[in-house]
């Protein structure tokens, strides 16, 4: 089990990179002037106490921002929000902090990120560009669910 | 007004086997982790397990491997513990508890009030 | 299996400040212990005060805070009450599993 964060670059089907604007992240064009986030994922250490086939449970966080995504209602709606934390101090809690965990499951390039504390509910972007990533219950042709992953370093 | 209510003292037989049963008001059980803990008279208090009611998923002090089985019905929002093979060892009071994470850390918020076994012929 | 353990029993004053310690058969008690400190008062009464060795459980007063101390947990009360006589359990993670102290009675007269 890798016990440092992994640092990645992450684009949507239409190549879209996820960009931070008034800390929230948003999807956008990839750009000469457009300056991606690097997004660091770890595996949970708990993964024996999880669901084995949803995918690989892994904390996300901005890489050197102190920035993690995690899942939270709204009301009766699940959101996804950047909370200020440390990706180590999620990785080295005695339990699997749920909120802060997604499964990570990779079909070919293509890889998806479902919520632990609200399964069914995944990463998304609209499929207009410029929109903040949300989480979507709805697979379909609104919002894009596939992201690819480019390992770095 | 989130609580954890235990069901009723048990005086039962040695050899017999026991269910005693937690259950949750004001939340959701599937969304936390409930403990189950042993505290015998004038001793300290020793850790059962823990389950994930989301999953069922569970883990277990070692000591308590094969002596004790938890598991959870969310439809009831309900835990349950099940104790085998009872021996006056057994003789205590059972908690469970909901260990929950704020901000940045886990913490035993909530407690129920306790069931009392007796194993006595 | 490790076993920790608490000062049996501990009287202070109101308005005093009195540590409780936690000690481990281990060696030193890190923040990888991530330590719990739990409240329990008559009639089976449970509140959890300090998880994370440092961090004070949502409601709980800030005369309760949680460190290090040496190669020992501790739970520091400033400024006792009264209604501060108790039994404190700590409580250390060890890998996958959770190891409870024999508890400190604190007396407050």
């Known amino acids: 089990k890798s016990e440092m964060p992994q640092p990645v670059s992450i684009q949507d089907i239409n190549h879209r990179v996820w960009v931070l604007q008034d800390q929230i992240l948003i999807a956008v064009p990839r750009k000469d002037r457009v300056s991606p986030v690097t997004i660091s994922l770890i595996s949970c250490r708990h993964v024996e106490t999880l669901e084995k086939d949803r995918g690989n449970p892994i904390y996300l966080g901005l890489n050197g921002l102190n920035l993690c995504l995690m899942c939270a209602k709204a009301g009766d709606q699940p959101t996804l929000q950047l909370k200020e934390k440390d990706i180590m101090d999620l990785y080295n809690q005695p339990e699997p902090v749920k909120s802060f965990l997604f499964y990570h499951s990779q079909s070919g390039r293509n890889s998806t990120f479902e919520s632990v504390a609200f399964p069914g509910w995944f990463i998304a972007v609209s499929s207009e560009g410029g929109c903040p990533l949300i989480l979507t219950q709805e697979l379909g042709k609104a919002n894009t669910t596939d992201f690819g992953l480019t390992m770095l370093f | 007004e989130v609580q954890l209510q235990q069901s009723g003292a048990e005086l039962v037989k040695p050899g017999a086997s026991v269910k005693l049963s937690c259950t949750a008001s004001g939340f959701n059980i599937k969304d936390t982790y409930i403990y189950w803990v042993k505290q015998r008279p004038e001793q300290g208090l020793e850790w059962i397990g823990r389950i994930d009611p989301a999953n069922g998923y569970t883990r277990y002090d070692p000591k308590f491997q094969g002596k004790a089985t938890m598991t959870a019905d969310t439809s009831s929002n309900t835990a349950y513990l099940q104790l085998s093979s009872l021996t006056s060892e057994d003789t205590a009071v059972y908690y469970c508890?909901?260990?929950?994470?704020?901000?940045?850390?886990?913490?035993?918020?909530?407690w129920g009030q306790g069931t009392t076994l007796t194993v006595s012929s | 299996q490790a076993v920790v353990t608490q000062e049996s029993a501990l009287t202070t004053s109101p308005g005093e400040t009195v540590t409780l310690t936690c000690r481990s058969s281990?060696?030193?008690?890190?923040?990888?212990?991530?330590a719990n400190w739990v409240q329990e008062k008559p009639d089976h009464l449970f509140t959890g005060l300090i998880g994370?060795?440092?961090n004070r459980a949502p409601g709980v007063p800030a005369r309760f805070s949680g460190s290090l101390i040496g190669d020992k947990a501790a739970l520091t009360i400033t400024g006792a009450q009264t209604e501060d006589e108790a039994i404190y359990f700590c409580?250390?993670?060890?890998?996958?599993?959770?190891?409870f102290g024999g508890g400190t009675k604190l007396t407050v007269l």
């Open positions: 508890a909901r260990y929950e994470y704020y901000d940045s850390s886990f913490y035993f918020d909530y």
């Open positions: 281990t060696g030193a008690v890190t923040t990888s212990n991530y």
């Open positions: 409580a250390l993670w060890y890998s996958n599993h959770l190891v």
């Open positions: 994370g060795t440092n």
